[in-house]
């Protein structure tokens, strides 16, 4: 009765458990009773990242500069190229196949988390006591000016988009 299963680094073919090819190599010919599996290294710009029985290696990913992409990590015969986005841009997906410009936080909102090559800017509404009067991908909400510490009084209340306006205290005549 021929085998129905093989060990993890083997595969079943023609009632034989043959050795899989190591990462970075592709299958040329299956083993027989008397000959080992024949494997060949992947070519330049190709890779295979697992023990395998593939007859063709995969092409390395191309980081297309026209899509805002650049190489973060060069591929090897065992690993794919890793792309990331140019400064000011981030990936649209986990696979990082294209990039979009980082979002700016509108006035009234501040940056909670600055964007990275793989994640967009995260904005948050400025809470009471804080404001943002610019559209920015970096600026956090700023605290209102403390008039008291300057021996001044609030002449105009602050909002989430504007700072308070301080003025001199009324002098008693």
């Amino acid at each position: 009765e021929p085998p129905t299963a093989c060990r993890e680094k083997q595969y079943l073919i023609n009632s034989q458990c043959c050795s899989l090819c190591q990462p970075g190599q592709k299958l040329v010919s299956d083993c027989t009773e008397f000959t080992e599996t024949e494997c060949l290294p992947c070519g330049e710009s190709e890779f295979l990242d697992t023990w395998n029985r593939e007859t063709h290696c995969h092409q390395h990913k191309y980081c297309d500069p026209n899509l805002g992409l650049r190489v973060q990590q060069k591929g090897t015969s065992e690993t794919d190229t890793i792309c990331t986005c140019e400064e000011g841009w981030h990936c649209t997906s986990e696979a990082c196949e294209s990039c979009v410009l980082h979002r700016s936080c509108s006035p009234g909102f501040g940056v909670k988390q600055i964007a990275t090559g793989v994640s967009d800017t995260i904005c948050e509404p400025c809470p009471v006591g804080f404001f943002s009067n610019v559209s920015s991908a970096f600026e956090k909400c700023h605290p209102w000016t403390s008039c008291e510490t300057k021996d001044l009084v609030v002449q105009q209340a602050g909002t989430n988009k504007t700072d308070v306006v301080c003025g001199p205290q009324d002098r008693l005549r």
């Epitope: 085998p3 129905t4 299963a5 093989c6 060990r7 993890e8 680094k9 034989q16 458990c17 050795s19 190591q22 190599q25 083993c31 027989t32 009773e33 008397f34 000959t35 080992e36 599996t37 494997c39």
Partner: antibody, heavy 127, light 107 residues
Framework: EVQLLESGGGLVRPGGSLRLSCAAS????????MNWVRQAPGKGLEWVSY????????DYADSVKGRFTVSRDNSKNLLYLQMNSLRAEDTAVYYC????????????????????WGQGTMVTVSS | DIQLTQSPSSLTASVGDRVTITCRSS??????LAWYQQKPGKPPKLLIY???SLEGGVPSRFSGSGSGTDFTLTISSLQPEDFATYYC?????????FGQGTKLEIK
């Protein structure tokens, strides 16, 4: 220290059941394929069963197929052998053994061997 | 199933002797063969894997050779601690099988 320790052996009547355990320590148990091998008194080694690292693939010697079940709990570093419908000819010392794949990138295709063995647990099937 | 036949079944030799044990497979198994040493009351110990590769920590007086169907284990100069039973095992396919063993005894 890399270790395997079997337990659960004992005297059982023909037709009875027994569950053997093998506790692994000193290595990442969930990364290794495992085996049960037995040895009847005064006899040679007989491979009994195999289980892949995830537990997805199992295989058995014809002599125990349909009666024995191998399983594993990687979270507890334990290997099991459930033995049902036991017969007198199942009387043996049962060893658990680690399968290892030896590989050196210059020496394809690599090779398997059983590099770590427990001390064994005795199973006696008798009326 | 693949059958492994070891010869001889038993062997008497002296310290310093060169000893060869053979293992023949009923079908080609390439180099998917391991050799083990077992002493009474102890579990087997891996000596050779892949027909000819020496396991770490095993003395260099042990060597393995062969491919396909015919394999040999050689001990170049027997030491007192080498007297034991030796088994070959094929790991080519399931069911994995062992040879019947060769008992090496002191003369």
């Amino acid at each position: 220290e890399v270790q395997l320790l079997e337990s659960g052996g004992g005297l059982v009547r023909p037709g009875g059941s027994l569950r053997l355990s093998c506790a692994a320590s000193g290595f990442t148990f969930g990364s290794y394929e495992m085996n049960w091998v037995r040895q009847a008194p005064g006899k040679g080694l007989e491979w009994v069963s195999y289980i892949s690292s995830s537990g997805e693939t199992t295989d058995y010697a014809d002599s125990v197929k349909g009666r024995f079940t191998v399983s594993r709990d990687n979270s507890k570093n334990l290997l099991y052998l459930q033995m049902n419908s036991l017969r007198a000819e199942d009387t043996a010392v049962y060893y658990c053994a680690r399968d290892v794949f030896f590989f050196d990138s210059s020496g394809f295709p690599g090779a398997y061997g059983m590099d770590v063995w427990g001390q064994g647990t005795m199973v006696t099937v008798s009326s | 199933d693949i059958q492994l036949t070891q010869s001889p079944s038993s062997l008497t030799a002296s310290v310093g002797d060169r000893v060869t044990i053979t293992c023949r497979s009923s079908q080609g198994i390439r180099s998917s063969l391991a050799w083990y040493q077992q002493k009474p009351g102890k579990p087997p110990k891996l000596l050779i894997y892949g027909a000819s590769s020496l396991e770490g920590g095993v003395p260099s007086r042990f060597s393995g050779s062969g491919s396909g169907t015919d394999f040999t284990l050689t001990i170049s100069s027997l030491q007192p601690e080498d007297f034991a039973t030796y088994y070959c095992q094929q790991l080519n396919s399931f069911p994995s099988t062992f040879g019947q063993g060769t008992k090496l005894e002191i003369k």
